[in-house]
């Protein structure tokens, strides 16, 4: 390709408009002023530039702002955002939630790209914590966002932000993540009454300890089996048959279908068969009558 550098006579762009789609790459490079481009970035999105042309426009901005783009430009990047690399984005200082929303909108409907992940990381680090408005925005665009964070990152989520979390946002969270989120949820919802509290806390119960499950069993909550199956095994094991019956209410019948799966299987092995028989569900595998149960973990701790 011919290397041409001078802007042809009469082709200097007085503004960013659709006439520029007729410019070759070298003409865009030579005839579009970078400062003009920066001030009229909002117009770029309305013009169907080819990806090749967008590369040229990006190059012009990179030359104008070698240390990273200012937020006034970032907010109006539109589809030029898709041309940015994570390295480019690491130079940015994005503080406005409106800017974040504008760029997430560009990527809407796609998987979270490395660019978006970097952008979110920069934004959250800049804010110092995941506040409610940010979490609201991020989970609206990426329902799995919360569960993509490490337990360490989740520890920066203030309890007040938990109000923004929807049940589907926790679908892919593992027990380690729920261990971090549950105490925050418990704190956030502590002033709610029994039934309302259970509705809100239910999605987080995969991080609940035994004593909280025992407390819930006294409140007629009627926990469904899907929630029960997501509880921590170590939290379920110490529960008595009576406590599980109270916890599940009418859903207790579902235990039969789950008797071979954790945590139900492990819980059954810890119960006296006599007690299991009181449920009338035909659950098998409990401790036979007359057997003495030694808690070896307790014995080791004492010796």
């Amino acid at each position: 390709e011919v290397e041409k550098t001078a802007c042809p006579s009469g082709k200097k762009a007085p503004e960013i408009d659709e006439s520029l789609i007729f410019y070759k790459k070298w003409e865009l490079e030579a005839c579009v002023d970078a400062a003009l481009l920066a001030t009229q970035m909002d117009r770029v999105n309305a013009i169907p530039f080819t990806y090749e042309q967008l590369d040229v426009l990006k190059h012009k901005l990179d030359e104008l702002y070698p240390q990273g783009y200012p937020e006034s430009v970032i907010q109006h990047l539109g589809y030029l955002f898709l041309k940015m690399s994570p390295e480019d984005i690491r130079k940015w200082n994005v503080t406005s939630l409106e800017t974040l929303k504008a760029l997430l909108e560009v990527n809407k409907g796609h998987e979270m790209s490395p660019q978006v992940a970097t952008l979110i990381d920069r934004f959250v680090k800049g804010r110092g914590q995941l506040d409610k408005d940010t979490l609201d925005t991020l989970t609206a665009f990426y329902p799995g966002y919360l569960c993509s964070l490490s337990p360490e990152e989740l520890s920066s989520v203030p309890p007040s932000s938990i109000w923004a979390v929807r049940p589907q946002d926790l679908d892919t969270c593992d027990p380690r993540q729920l261990d971090v989120l549950y105490p925050k949820a418990r704190l956030a919802f502590q002033n709610m009454n029994g039934s309302e509290y259970f509705v809100k806390i239910q999605s987080f119960l995969g991080g609940a300890p035994t004593e909280d499950l025992k407390a819930l069993s006294q409140q007629n909550v009627s926990m469904d089996l899907a929630t029960f199956m997501k509880l921590r095994t170590d939290a379920v094991l110490p529960l008595t048959v009576a406590e599980v019956q109270k916890l599940l209410g009418p859903h207790v019948e579902g235990l039969k279908a789950e008797e071979r799966h954790r945590p139900v299987r492990d819980w059954i092995l810890r119960q006296r068969q006599d007690d299991l028989d009181t449920l009338g569900l035909g659950l098998q595998g409990g401790i036979p009558n007359g057997y003495l149960v030694l808690d070896l973990s307790m014995q080791e701790a004492l010796s």
Partner: nanobody, 121 residues
């Protein structure tokens, strides 16, 4: 999968005419953006003509009055009628399609493989 395929290229004498056609599958030109680019030997690709409901019909200065772009919605094609052809029109002609997003702005772009147009006596 989106596919854009050009046809109609060939050898033509100066002053002659040629009609290029571009058929798309997986994307409709109606409501989106369709255009014809060309690339002459040693030159960069340039837009010749384009049309969309958002921007209307546009032509590059060198082809105004000689080239006409049109769409056939039923066949989902974008055609380029080229009249009064000269040697300077010799190039590979590419069909281009761009998705217009409902929320504004432009999405994915698609290119054809190109069709050679040679104007020579």
């Amino acid at each position: 999968e989106v596919q854009v395929v050009e046809s109609g290229g060939g050898l033509v004498q100066p002053g002659g005419s040629l009609r290029l056609s571009c058929a798309a599958s997986g994307i409709t030109f109606s409501g989106n953006y369709g255009g014809w680019f060309r690339q002459a030997p040693g030159e960069q690709r340039e837009l010749v003509a384009s049309m969309s409901s958002a921007l209307g019909t546009k032509y590059a200065d060198p082809v105004k009055g000689r080239f006409t772009i049109s769409t056939d919605t039923a066949k989902n094609t974008v055609d380029l009628q080229m009249n009064s052809l000269g040697p300077e029109d010799t190039a590979v002609y590419y069909c281009y399609a761009r998705v217009r997003l409902s929320r504004g702005g432009w999405g994915s772009e698609y290119w054809g493989q190109g069709t050679q147009v040679t104007v020579s006596s």
